[in-house]
Interface confidence: medium
């Protein structure tokens, strides 16, 4: 199947930032795409492709854009109001409880188990016991057969905040 791409691949390349624009806070908050000045009097725009803010805020700095790693595809670029969207490449996945890196999906199920779920960018293949139908979790002691059509790419660390 086709390769998966990261959010950076989906979004445009980072642009040169225009001069920062200023406006006044509303009830002490600045709109998405801005942060508040140190004296609290101005809202300063985030720099396109460099940082962003998604909500009304009183941040002194905009949040730094994520940069997708080599093992990821960029789905969409970082704008002043939205962070980069990155996704693990085909054959690798990132679990919510270990978001720091894309890990290789298993290529098959252990003996006595059958595959019921595919490798996706957010989950490993899913295996269940042939008889009981219960899910398998943990390390795979032995692989009965290869069940995916492509081995994927090596896992690589995936930074979430720049």
């Amino acid at each position: 199947e086709s390769a998966l791409i990261t959010q950076q691949d989906l979004a445009p390349q980072q642009r040169a930032a225009p001069q920062q624009k200023r406006s006044s806070p509303s009830e002490g908050l600045c709109p998405p795409g801005h942060h508040i000045s140190e004296d609290g009097r101005d809202c300063i725009s985030c720099k396109y492709g460099q940082d962003y803010s998604t909500h009304w805020n009183d941040l002194l700095f905009c949040l730094r854009c994520t940069r997708c790693d080599s093992g990821e595809v960029e789905l969409s670029p970082c704008t002043t109001t939205r962070n980069t969207v990155c996704q693990c490449e085909e054959g690798t996945f990132r679990e919510e409880d270990s978001p720091e890196m894309c890990r290789k999906c298993r290529t098959g199920c252990p003996r006595g188990m059958v595959k019921v779920g595919d490798c996706t960018p957010w989950s490993d293949i899913e295996c269940v016991h042939k008889e009981s139908g219960t899910k398998h979790s943990g390390e795979v002691p032995a692989v009965e057969e290869t069940v995916t059509s492509s081995p994927g790419t090596p896992a690589s660390p995936c930074s979430l905040s720049g």
Partner: antibody, heavy 124, light 107 residues
Framework: GVQLVESGGGLVQPGGSLRLSCAAS????????MSWVRQAPGKGLEWVAN????????YYVDSVKGRFTISRDNAKNSLYLQMNSLRAEDTAVYYC?????????????????WGRGTTVTVSS | SELTQDPAVSVALGQTVRITCQGD??????ASWYQQKPGQAPVLVIY???NRPSGIPDRFSGSSSGNTASLTITGAQAEDEADYYC???????????FGGGTKLTVL
């Protein structure tokens, strides 16, 4: 290999209906957003509609809203386009296209592969 | 939301040509590029920042800046003569839009 094959096109009178089908093979159909794209004779490509992996989200170009319905049957690895109240301007080759990537949220908008297309002619 | 392409571009055999695509949505979403020859279905040649599907020659490359995406063919070949279309998600992120297409002639 990965393949998409459209069917169901033909000649229909204005106001009539057609149902297009797209048979998918060689990949896990239920993992991908799917789209219909059309091309009028001598014209460019126009995205028509797309549908999320589980069918829970569907989007349409404004010109077909309320007349066309996209649907899918993951058990049959099939995509459909029900076209009602057809107009002369709906005359086109209709392509079935798969999203290049498995994505959880919105469609990437990057299409690969494409089917060979099925021709719809709306004429009296 | 619209994407705008030049209707026609020509290039001498072996020379470099750039085909451009403009639209507001390209500030938020990457384009992809398709090659279509007469009587055939479109073929994806570039997607995202600058990614080529397997089987696409490395003379094809992509880039983007501001509201413009570009497809560059370095050392154009006779077989590159075709219509080229860009597309991306529209500004809402849910719909998809195509450019009007560029007819490339290799002289």
């Amino acid at each position: 290999g990965v393949q998409l094959v459209e069917s169901g096109g033909g000649l229909v009178q204005p106001g009539g209906s057609l149902r297009l089908s797209c048979a998918a093979s060689g990949f896990t159909f239920s993992s991908y957003w799917m789209s219909w794209v059309r091309q009028a004779p001598g014209k460019g490509l126009e995205w028509v509609a797309n549908i999320k992996q589980d069918g829970s989200e569907k989007y349409y170009v404004d010109s077909v809203k309320g007349r066309f319905t996209i649907s899918r049957d993951n058990a049959k690895n099939s995509l459909y386009l029900q076209m009602n109240s057809l107009r002369a301007e709906d005359t086109a080759v209709y392509y079935c296209a798969r999203d290049l990537l498995k994505v959880k949220g919105s469609s990437s908008g990057w299409f690969d592969p494409w089917g060979r297309g099925t021709t719809v002619t709306v004429s009296s | 939301s619209e994407l705008t392409q030049d209707p026609a571009v020509s290039v001498a055999l072996g020379q470099t040509v750039r085909i451009t695509c403009q639209g507001d949505s390209l500030r938020s979403y990457y384009a992809s590029w398709y090659q279509q020859k007469p009587g055939q279905a479109p073929v994806l040649v570039i997607y995202g920042k600058n990614n080529r599907p397997s089987g696409i020659p490395d003379r094809f490359s992509g880039s983007s800046s501001g509201n413009t995406a570009s497809l560059t063919i370095t050392g154009a070949q006779a077989e590159d003569e075709a219509d080229y279309y860009c597309n991306s998600r529209d500004s809402s992120g849910n719909h998809v839009v195509f450019g009007g297409g560029t007819k490339l002639t290799v002289l």
